[in-house]
């Protein structure tokens, strides 16, 4: 039994880091493998993560962690029974994938304006809370070409757009994702999408 693709890990900078790897053949990850991880500080001890299957030869492990700080560094040991298959380390602050925003809502009752709001996925005491920026994706269910991205580079989790920038009388969907420039993070997953029917009054044309 050998590791084909070494574990790579990302942290949500809050409580969970996710490590994925591939074995050289079909593996029952949860019964055959264990990933031990230990924070490199005085008095810390190793914790065990039981991996799950992620495709035939793929494994994934969700490591429970405390609030993350930039100094945190973990040793990682991948074991198959008594055999050490791989040894490495992981600095969560250098491999951050933010949590996805939640509670995306489209408010259509504002005069000819669409107000999209969502929730910051972090509590106020988390470092990322004040460092997230967002991308909002809006697309038409009827027209695949009608697909747009709005970059929200301010901290407020909201976006206002004129309803008239979208076609009237058809349904749209929106979703949002986040990233943090300060840690050069990857993008989060997209939030669940929300749907609304876009309708607005055409401006009265004078001749």
């Amino acid at each position: 039994m050998k590791v084909l693709q070494e574990p790579t890990c990302v942290s949500d900078y809050m409580s969970i880091s996710t490590c994925e790897w591939k074995m050289n053949g079909p593996t029952n990850c949860s019964t055959e493998l264990r990933l031990l991880y230990q924070l490199v500080f005085l008095l810390s001890e190793a914790h065990t993560c039981i991996p799950e299957n992620n495709g035939g030869a793929g494994c994934v492990c969700h490591l429970l962690m405390d609030d993350v700080v930039s100094a945190d560094n973990y040793t990682l040991d991948l074991w198959a029974g008594q055999q050490l298959l791989w040894k490495g380390s992981f600095k969560p602050s250098e491999h951050v994938k933010p949590r996805a925003p939640g509670n995306l809502t489209v408010h259509t009752n504002v005069s000819d304006t669409l107000l999209l709001t969502w929730s910051n996925p972090y509590p106020p005491d988390n470092y990322l809370y004040n460092h997230l920026t967002y991308a909002v994706n809006i697309w038409s269910e009827n027209d695949p070409a009608d697909f747009r991205i709005y970059n929200v580079t301010y901290l407020e989790p909201s976006l206002r757009i004129a309803a008239s920038t979208l076609k009237s009388g058809i349904s749209y969907r929106a979703r949002v994702r986040a990233w943090a420039q300060c840690y050069n993070t990857t993008w989060s997953e997209w939030s669940p999408s929300t749907k609304w029917h876009n309708s607005y009054r055409e401006p009265f044309e004078q001749h």
Partner: antibody, heavy 117, light 112 residues
């Protein structure tokens, strides 16, 4: 929210014994090392002992080795400190604390041990 | 054992003014990853100690941003940018580099 509640302190004669307990809640107890720290009346803080999350590793300041024993019961979320051969100079408030990144992130309210004849 | 030495022993302060406490260790607490294994604690009158700063510079959750930690190696400083009445108490530094964990002797901060 981390909560630590010490108990078991009291008045004991020199040479006597006491067992201190610390009931933990608000966090996954078995994942954390725990420490005991004491403070003699009007004095500073003195680290006594620590124990790893699994209970397999214990650590003591030299002056307490052989007299004090730290232990834990993860099924009861409880930390213990057995105090033997007590002396007058062991009179102090004993605090339990949760360790994280080596430091003491969360303290109990303390329990007073008085050694006197 | 690592010896921690704090100064001053007592620090009378005026509310609204800054304050500074020094802590020196008998050996370096700097770690190669760029942080220092030093914590600061405050024990308010009649209360248990509480963590203020860990790993030299990281403020603990809920600690006001008027508290900051600095320094490296063997010389460390806790600064209070503007002292408030609720900041009175005894401040301790503690090294987390090796066991036994050792504390400084404490600095008593009191209002003038």
């Amino acid at each position: 929210e981390v909560q630590l509640v010490e108990s078991g302190g009291g008045l004991v004669q020199p040479g006597g014994s006491l067992r201190l307990s610390c009931a933990a809640s608000g966090f996954t107890f078995s994942r954390y090392a725990m420490s005991w720290v004491r403070q003699a009346p009007g004095k500073g803080l003195e680290w006594v002992s620590a124990i790893g999350g699994s209970g397999g590793h214990t650590y003591y300041a030299d002056s307490f080795k052989g007299r004090f024993t730290i232990s834990r019961d993860n099924s009861k979320n409880t930390l213990y400190l057995q105090l033997n051969s007590l002396r007058a100079e062991d009179t102090a408030v004993y605090y339990c604390a949760r360790n994280l990144r080596g430091g003491l992130h969360g303290w109990g309210q303390g329990t007073l041990v008085t050694v006197s004849s | 054992d690592i010896v921690m030495t704090q100064s001053p022993l007592s620090l009378p302060v005026t509310p609204g003014e800054p304050a500074s406490i020094s802590c020196k260790s008998s050996q370096s607490l700097h770690h190669g990853q760029g942080y220092n294994r030093l914590d600061w604690y405050l024990q308010k009158p009649g209360q248990s100690p509480q963590l203020l700063i860990y790993l030299g510079t990281h403020r603990a959750s809920g600690v006001p941003d008027r508290f900051s930690g600095s320094g490296s190696g063997t010389d460390f400083t806790l600064k209070i940018s503007r002292v408030e009445a609720e900041d009175v108490g005894i401040y301790y530094c503690m090294q987390t580099h090796q066991t036994p964990l050792t504390f400084g002797g404490g600095t008593k901060v009191e209002i003038k």
